[in-house]
């Protein structure tokens, strides 16, 4: 989508590149903060964020965290760096190209999160990795 | 509220050259990275060129050499330099900073 392959001037400290070794551009990401959500028992949601932001800074990922408590339902979406802790978390799964959500124990609320590195990704938040299948005897034993 | 007014697009011949800007209001472009992203006529939004707030910058392979990108802090403004333009060159052209502001793109049609 945004250019496999980038070059950079040499006059920068901090050198980003992707898995080819080429410079990386800097990831575009739905950045809508917080919002309250409709997301509930769901395989997968749309996170309904209409901003798409580039990041502050080449090494930010898109980021994409689920809470329900006995009031509401949140999606917070999100730029962050993957080698600072999020919510106290490490983002485990910053390389993935999809937002495959995760729990995490937190009190007193549900709590997923996922991370991603390829552009508006968070914009298609999966809560099942089989979700994306093309097997419809597998979805058949999902759902039952 | 903050605005990115863009100018400078328009038809030129095989070879020739444009100088697209980027002027914002209601936000410090010195502070922000500023990126160019163009979208070709049937192809999906790609990255084009990229400015970070200390002046480093990053290019497309494809316009590498071609296109320069730069900054005027005094006038709250990021230029877009594309020389040697070719026809897939071709497409609008926008310019973004976060979080989240677009320009209202700007056409550029190569011949």
């Known amino acids: 989508t945004i250019p496999p392959h980038v070059q950079k001037s040499v006059n920068n400290d901090m050198i980003v590149t992707d898995n080819n070794g080429a410079v990386k551009f800097p990831q575009l990401c739905k950045f809508c903060d917080v919002r309250f959500s409709t997301c509930d028992n769901q395989k997968s949601c749309m996170s309904n964020c209409s901003i798409t932001s580039i990041c502050e800074k080449p090494q930010e990922v898109c980021v994409a965290v689920w809470r329900k408590n006995d009031e509401n339902i949140t999606l917070e979406t999100v730029c962050h760096d993957p080698k600072l802790p999020y919510h106290d978390f490490i983002l485990e799964d910053a390389a993935s190209p999809k937002c495959i959500m995760k729990e995490k124990k937190k009190p007193g609320e549900t709590f997923f999160m996922c991370s991603c590195s390829s552009d508006e990704c968070n914009d298609n938040i999966i809560f099942s990795e089989e979700y994306n299948t093309s097997n419809p005897d597998l979805l058949l034993v999902i759902f039952q | 509220q903050v605005q990115l007014q863009q100018s400078g697009g328009g038809l030129v011949q095989a070879g020739g050259s444009l100088r697209l800007s980027c002027a914002a209001s209601?936000?410090?472009?010195?502070?922000?990275?500023v990126a160019w992203y163009r979208q070709p006529p049937g192809k999906q939004r790609e990255g084009v060129a990229h400015?970070?707030?200390?002046?480093?910058?990053i290019y497309a392979d494809s316009v590498k050499g071609r296109f320069t990108v730069s900054r005027d802090n005094a006038k709250n403004t990021v230029y877009l330099e594309m020389n040697s333009l070719k026809p897939e060159d071709t497409g609008v052209y926008y310019c973004?900073?976060?979080?989240?502001?677009w320009g209202q793109g700007t056409q550029v049609t190569v011949s």
């Open positions: 973004t900073a976060p979080v989240g502001y």
């Open positions: 209601g936000i410090t472009f010195s502070t922000k990275p």
């Open positions: 400015i970070s707030s200390d002046g480093t910058t």
